[in-house]
């Protein structure tokens, strides 16, 4: 039975040209995290394998930095980065947990962070 929950940074906004940290946290389970994938709907951004370390997709290598922790830092943001991001936790023995973050990249200098929320 999957008892865990993923807490994410929720709906967030950031300025064009700036950077943002995408963070998820898995709680309420003793399952072992074997790998975390960071994805958009149609493509892989990065993988953090607990044993083998990080893989960053070549199309993001210039502006994605691993961490902090299992998170991902997106740099040099453009308005095209607006959209949904998913953290996919591969765990043993529970299976897969998925968290969702919506990022809005703003032209203006007003970029307020949304509240954190949980996805069961």
């Amino acid at each position: 039975m999957m008892t865990g929950t993923i807490e994410t940074t929720g709906n967030i906004s950031a300025e064009k040209g700036g950077s943002i940290i995408l963070q998820c946290h898995l709680s309420s389970t003793t399952a072992q995290v074997t790998q975390v994938n960071w994805e958009q709907q149609d493509q892989l951004l990065a993988i953090c394998n607990a044993d083998l370390g990080w893989h960053i997709s070549p199309s993001f290598k210039d502006r994605v930095a691993p961490g902090p922790g299992l998170g991902l830092t997106l740099q040099s943001l453009t308005v095209n980065d607006t959209g949904e991001y998913f953290c996919i936790y591969h765990t043993y023995p529970d299976g897969t947990y998925t968290g969702r973050i919506f990022l809005e990249v703003l032209e203006s200098s007003v970029a307020e962070h949304g509240a954190r929320f949980q996805i069961p």
Epitope: Q35, L52, I56, S57
Partner: antibody, heavy 119, light 107 residues
Framework: QVQLVQSGAEVKKPGASVKISCKTS????????LHWVRQAPGQGLEWIGG????????SYAQKFQGRATLTVDKSTSTAYMELSSLRSEDTAVYYC????????????WGQGTLVTVSS | DIQMTQSPSSLSASVGDRVTITCRAS??????VVWYQQKPGKAPKLLIY???YRYTGVPSRFSGSGSGTDFTFTISSVQPEDFATYYC?????????FGQGTKLEIK
């Protein structure tokens, strides 16, 4: 340039163990993950497992869990793969392969080590 | 484990032909697929990664495409040195798995 040089061919009896080395050069040893892949005669490629030289973290294919052991010696920039309880179906060419910085693609390969298991 | 199914298993072509090899993953692997070339008695060589980037020094006649579960590897004009076996591999999750290989032979 990046080089992976493996130890020579081995002939072993069933039940024995074999330990193959993979000496690397041309890059910072702790920056690239090292993997082991085998190929039985006339067959395809099979991933055995990988090791992160930075922290010693290992990942194995289930088939080899408990029978293969991957280690590294940072002082000599060398990776090792030991396979125990050998059987005839373990006869294969064993390759070490390096994946680049923040990458899982196997960009660098050793020349291969033929292990023959025969009574 | 993720299965990678390659087709065809063998392929005959003449120099100058355009050839296409396909690889199907048993589940979504996004863009985490690479292609290798192997010649008899030699170690594999990385050709294409993620899955449309040519590795350093790889000629432009080699290309790759696809995302999700379906991937394609193409040689636009086969050269004599291209006759070899080609493998796809996924690195979306461990264990990293290979296709069974496609042997490209001279017609």
């Amino acid at each position: 340039q990046v080089q992976l040089v493996q130890s020579g061919a081995e002939v072993k009896k069933p039940g024995a163990s074999v330990k193959i080395s993979c000496k690397t050069s041309g890059y910072t040893f702790t920056e690239y993950t090292l993997h082991w892949v085998r190929q039985a005669p006339g067959q395809g490629l099979e991933w055995i497992g990988g090791i992160n030289p930075n922290n010693g973290g290992t990942s194995y294919a289930q088939k080899f869990q408990g029978r293969a052991t991957l280690t590294v010696d940072k002082s000599t920039s060398t990776a090792y793969m030991e396979l125990s309880s050998l059987r005839s179906e373990d006869t294969a060419v064993y390759y070490c392969a390096g994946s680049g910085y923040y990458d899982y693609s196997f960009a660098y390969w050793g020349q291969g080590t033929l292990v023959t298991v025969s009574s | 484990d993720i299965q990678m199914t390659q087709s065809p298993s063998s392929l005959s072509a003449s120099v100058g032909d355009r050839v296409t090899i396909t690889c199907r993953a048993s589940q979504d692997v996004k863009n985490a697929v690479v292609w290798y070339q192997q010649k008899p008695g030699k170690a594999p060589k990385l050709l294409i990664y993620s899955p449309s980037y040519r590795y350093t020094g790889v000629p432009s006649r080699f290309s790759g495409s696809g995302s999700g579960t379906d991937f394609t590897f193409t040689i636009s004009s086969v050269q004599p040195e291209d006759f070899a076996t080609y493998y796809c591999q996924q690195h979306y999750s461990t264990p990293f798995t290979f296709g069974q290989g496609t042997k490209l032979e001279i017609k």
